[in-house]
């Protein structure tokens, strides 16, 4: 399956939207920095069959969608930017789902690496727990926004490697 060029553009637009979402100066939030334990190895893409890599990307985008769809998120971020953000994430989820369907029967390996999916879910659970502990403060959201932007940048690298694998 070829991930369409529109998918790559959508990923870039997502990063641009997230960059615009900032409400307060991150300089004032240094003390709230936190190690969420980003699962780097799940995005290295070396040990995966293509379908498994796609399922990990899908999980990350789905979890991001869930994270930013809460009422606490809606109360924090600009509504217009959030709507644009949802649209881009939805586009990416559709692209990845279409790709996953095409991969059915192409490879002998399972479509999903369950351990990898669980690792991504636990990563997002840590982010949610952090927000809860910080009472969804503006700085906590700034830290999370920075973390998700980094995650998207790293996942873009995995997508690029997948594209080169064609």
């Amino acid at each position: 399956c070829d991930l369409p060029q529109t998918h790559s553009l959508s990923n870039r637009r997502t990063l641009m939207i997230m960059a615009q979402m900032g409400r307060i100066s991150p300089f004032s939030c240094l003390k709230d920095r936190h190690d969420f334990g980003f699962p780097q190895e799940e995005f290295d893409g070396n040990q995966f069959q293509k379908a498994q890599a796609i399922s990990v990307l899908h999980e990350m985008i789905q979890q991001t969608f869930n994270l930013f769809s809460t009422k606490d998120s809606s109360a924090t971020w600009d509504e217009t930017l959030l709507d644009k953000f949802y649209t881009e994430l939805y586009q990416q989820l559709n692209d990845l789902e279409a790709c996953m369907m095409q991969e059915v029967g192409v490879e002998d390996t399972p479509l999903m690496n369950v351990d990898s999916i669980l690792t991504v879910r636990k990563y997002f659970q840590r982010i949610t727990l952090y927000l809860t502990e910080k009472k969804y403060s503006p700085c906590a959201w700034e830290v999370v926004r920075a973390e998700i932007m980094r995650s998207f940048s790293l996942s873009a690298n995995l997508q690029e490697r997948l594209r080169r694998k064609e």
Epitope: A19, P26, F27, D32, H34, D35, R150
Partner: antibody, heavy 121, light 107 residues
Framework: EVQLVQSGAEVKKPGESLKISCKGS????????IGWVRQMPGKGLEWMGI????????RYSPSFQGQVTISADKSISTAYLQWSSLKASDTAMYYC??????????????WGQGTLVTVSS | DIQMTQSPSSLSASVGDRVTITCRAS??????LNWYQQKPGKAPKLLIY???SLQSGVPSRFSGSGSGTDFTLTISSLQPEDFATYYC?????????FGQGTKVEIK
């Protein structure tokens, strides 16, 4: 390979203006902040200020506020440190270094090679 | 501003010695502390971040510990290339501030 390359040594007279640069490569320039550090001859490190190149938001140490200006041009992945009127006491080595912002990653993990500024009449 | 005080300001040691440098912050900085090494004519080099995390490529003889206001950099067995000046730096709040430095010299 991540690199921060600074402009060359400068010899200036008191009262002159100066702008030195720090060009980043091998990474996403807007994903990291750029900090500036002064080291006067035979002395320790002094933190001057920092810029977020994504939106040019800047903060200065009180000691350097109003004395220098930090700026960035993200289109060419370059940060700047400038003086409008140099003093002999500005004679020092100036370093730039990158900072991961709010991400959990090593602080100031890459440094420029330094720019030696000499101010003498 | 948060003040950072290092001790000693200089020390003499031999190759193979265990060396300890301390850094004290004027208020709690949690674990937001970095350690740098600087050799004459060179840019500083990050050794330890977040009080105890070893920066990639740094030999394991370097270690950091502490939290709150008191921190320590330890070199378990001093090597010839370790003779340099070491700086601590708080990273919890702007303006970031450095300690005055500790010069490690050959005995």
């Amino acid at each position: 390979e991540v690199q921060l390359v600074q402009s060359g040594a400068e010899v200036k007279k008191p009262g002159e203006s100066l702008k030195i640069s720090c060009k980043g490569s091998g990474y996403s320039f807007t994903s990291y902040w750029i900090g500036w550090v002064r080291q006067m001859p035979g002395k320790g490190l002094e933190w001057m200020g920092i810029i977020d190149p994504s939106d040019s938001d800047t903060r200065y140490s009180p000691s350097f506020q109003g004395q220098v200006t930090i700026s960035a041009d993200k289109s060419i992945s370059t940060a700047y440190l400038q003086w409008s009127s140099l003093k002999a006491s500005d004679t020092a080595m100036y370093y730039c270094a990158r900072h991961p912002g709010l991400n959990w990653a090593p602080d100031f993990d890459y440094w420029g090679q330094g720019t030696l500024v000499t101010v003498s009449s | 501003d948060i003040q950072m005080t290092q001790s000693p300001s200089s020390l003499s040691a031999s190759v193979g010695d265990r060396v300890t440098i301390t850094c004290r912050a004027s208020q709690s900085i949690n674990r937001f502390l970095n350690w740098y090494q600087q050799k004459p004519g060179k840019a500083p080099k990050l050794l330890i971040y977040a009080a105890s995390s070893l920066q990639s490529g740094v030999p394991s003889r370097f270690s950091g510990s502490g939290s709150g206001t008191d921190f320590t950099l330890t070199i378990s067995s001093l090597q010839p290339e370790d003779f340099a000046t070491y700086y601590c730096q708080q990273a919890i709040d702007l303006p970031f501030t450095f300690g005055q430095g500790t010069k490690v010299e050959i005995k």
